[in-house]
């Protein structure tokens, strides 16, 4: 006879995104023996909530934790019956909720209680629903993305850590209520709500990030439909051909377009938009949403924010690379380069509403949209973080790392279970993010 | 086919103001942007400023900022032009084009300009 | 602030190819627009995006454009195209054009 190793125990975790469009469930799994190392822990599985973000429950709070019920009964099927105790279930709420706790605190609250009273009833362990902060959202994300990169740590032959200091990668979300701009950078921040020092794998990590509440996706395409609105003619960014009723309501319930919003208007009343396929006008639309004039600063992004140069390589994920790979792919045009995201982004918005079908078999609800989310993408890089050429080379559109979604649920789940020591084993334990 | 007709000449004394009038036929003025550019005597072209009508966004070049204004009237389908505090170096020829959108927003249609003199 | 620079002059014999040139920092990456001017005229504008012609425009005008320089061609220059040919850029940075200084094309013969 031969001894058999016995395969090495595995540890779960459980985490659900609450965004402000959606929620998904993300199932992580990685060896006991091996929790200190990085990029160990990887994607078991996920599951997409159906329906809208928990924040869309606003008004009948008991249905955002019914929601849930779906995934969680997968999740059951997912992780191992005897592991069920031991893994750690956690739902982090981002600028949707945000959002819903700027107009109604009252809501935002009793939504938390219903989606705390559904995950109390499953057998994991269950350790509490909270709203992140834009900084939160946007350190989580660079850590998943380097954690999955193994860009923190080695392990080296001679059984000691080795620590590259390959550099880290820059990490830029866009959401559908809030988007993200976070990278390592050596200049001290001017102003320390940017500024956040991560101590890992015994190296220190000075990085800059920034929330900007209102610019995901799908919030842009409000005060975009909003601007328009004020016109009431049509929409450059849409497709000539495309039409559509807009109900006013809508349009201007959220924080994101309150500026926007008419003294008076009927909340029920709908009107008519069409779409003109005028990339041009687009263009001026979109410049719209960036106030770059006024910095208090030596330098800024746009709105005022602080921003050092961009400096190394990003990862630009969610938002970002559905909109890239649909140009790439659907469009069939190449994005490799700034003027080549110009080009690509005006093609796509002078394309009719007839030409956009004709490339897309089957009805694609979000078709009308990419033309002004590609316009907002080119801008955001370019005019608003100021990517040049040189450093738009450094930017890569992606999904996923190691099989693993990126986003800010992974990184939360380092930090909340400690599966990022903040020393060298041997040394200290415990994560310090400060 | 889209056509620009400017104001006539004009004489100012230093100090003042003056405004120029951009009238557009021939073609929807919400459908692009209009851009002002000037040419002072034996000098080269200078770009002033836009307005995008449609949306009523105004952008002006870091010079002329503080000191000119461009407005357009949707309903007579003009654009204007006004430049304070004349001096003597704003003696130019004022033109107006559009900022085409089939030429990714370069100026394909021009009048043939206004000319502004300031002397005292 | 962005600059574009132009040389004041360039000569060229009647049937024989005009350069001109127009260098900006980094100007390949944005895309450049050429104006021909002839005197008391408005300008017209011969390349947009870098090597595009409007209709209208003569195959003879070519441009290109990488690096720091962008480069009007005019091929079998002809006595008609002697004019003040100008370089402009649009700074998506600053949200406005900017204009090169203009170059006096002289076609020689």
């Known amino acids: 006879t031969q001894d058999v190793r016995e395969p090495p125990a595995l540890k779960y975790g459980i985490v659900l995104d609450a965004g402000s469009s959606h929620t998904s469930m993300f199932v992580y799994k990685w060896p006991a023996d091996k929790e200190n190392d990085t990029g160990i822990v990887g994607q078991h599985s996920s599951c997409d909530v159906r329906g809208g973000g928990i924040s869309s429950y606003a008004n009948d709070p008991s249905r955002a934790g019914q929601s849930l019920v779906e995934c969680l009964e997968q999740a059951l099927r997912d992780v191992p019956k005897d592991r069920y105790a031991s893994t750690p279930l956690y739902l982090g709420a981002t600028a949707g909720m945000r959002l819903l706790n700027l107009t109604s605190p009252e809501a935002t609250a009793k939504v938390l209680e219903a989606v705390t009273q559904t995950l109390t009833r499953y057998p994991f362990d269950f350790r509490g629903a909270r709203i992140l902060s834009g900084q939160d959202e946007g350190v989580f994300g660079w850590v998943t993305a380097n954690y999955l990169l193994e860009n923190f740590i080695k392990y080296g032959w001679v059984g000691r850590w080795i620590r590259p200091r390959k550099g880290t990668l820059g990490a830029m979300d866009l959401g559908g209520a809030s988007t993200q701009i976070t990278f390592e950078t050596t200049s001290p921040s001017e102003d320390p709500d940017n500024e956040v020092h991560l101590r890992l794998y015994g190296q220190h990590y000075r990085v800059y990030t920034h929330s900007f509440l209102c610019y995901g996706r799908d919030q842009v395409l409000q005060r975009l439909l909003a601007s328009a609105l004020q016109i009431h003619r049509f929409h450059p960014c849409w497709p000539k051909g495309y039409s559509t009723q807009v109900l006013l309501r809508e349009v201007y319930q959220s924080p994101c377009t309150m500026g926007q919003r008419p003294q008076t208007f009927n909340s029920s009343a709908t009107v008519s938009l069409s779409g003109t396929s005028n990339a041009a006008l687009c263009r001026d639309l979109v410049s719209g949403l960036f106030n770059i004039s006024s910095c208090p600063f030596s330098q800024c992004s746009f709105n005022g924010v602080f921003q050092p140069p961009v400096a190394g390589n990003f990862i630009a994920f969610s938002a970002f690379y559905y909109t890239v790979d649909f140009l790439k792919t659907v469009m069939g045009l190449p994005v490799g380069t700034l003027k080549q995201l110009e080009d690509a982004t005006e093609t796509t918005c002078n394309q009719t509403w007839a030409e956009l079908q004709a490339r897309v078999p089957g009805q694609q609800t979000r078709l009308p949209d990419y033309c002004a989310v590609a316009m907002f993408i080119h801008q955001l890089l370019s005019r608003g973080y100021r990517f040049d050429e040189r450093s738009f080379r450094g930017v890569v559109f992606e999904k996923k790392a190691a099989d693993t979604a990126v986003g800010w649920a992974l990184g939360y789940m380092l930090n909340l279970t400690n599966l990022i020591p903040a020393d060298l084993p041997g040394l200290r334990k415990g994560t310090h993010f400060s | 086919q889209v056509q620009l007709v400017q104001s006539g000449a004009e004489v100012k004394k230093p100090g003042s103001s003056v405004k120029v009038s951009c009238k557009a036929s021939?073609?929807?003025?919400?459908?692009?942007?209009v851009s002002w550019v000037r040419q002072a005597p034996g000098q080269g072209l200078e770009w002033m400023g836009r307005?995008?009508?449609?949306?009523?966004?105004?952008q002006y070049a870091q010079k002329f900022q503080g000191r000119v204004t461009i407005t357009a009237d949707e309903s007579t389908s003009t654009a204007y032009m006004e430049l304070s505090s004349l001096r003597s170096e704003d003696t130019a020829v004022y033109y107006c084009a559009r900022e085409s959108p089939g030429y990714r927003y370069s100026f394909d249609v021009w009048d043939q300009g206004t000319l502004v003199t300031v002397s005292s | 602030s962005y600059e574009l620079t132009q040389p004041l002059s360039v000569s060229v014999a009647l049937g024989q190819t005009a350069r001109i040139t127009c260098s900006g920092d980094?100007?390949?990456?944005?895309?450049v627009y050429w104006y021909q001017q002839k005197p008391g005229q408005a300008p017209v504008l011969v390349i947009y995006?870098?090597?595009n012609r409007p209709s209208g425009i003569p195959e003879r005008f070519s441009g290109s454009n990488s690096g720091n320089t962008a480069t009007l061609t005019i091929s079998r220059a002809q006595a008609g195209d002697e004019a003040d040919y100008y370089c402009a850029s649009y700074d998506l940075q600053q949200a406005r054009w900017v204009f090169g200084g203009g170059t006096k094309l002289t076609v020689l013969g």
């Open positions: 021939g073609g929807t003025f919400d459908s692009y942007a």
């Open positions: 995006d870098d090597n």
């Open positions: 307005i995008v009508p449609w949306l009523g966004h105004t």
């Open positions: 980094a100007i390949g990456e944005k895309y």
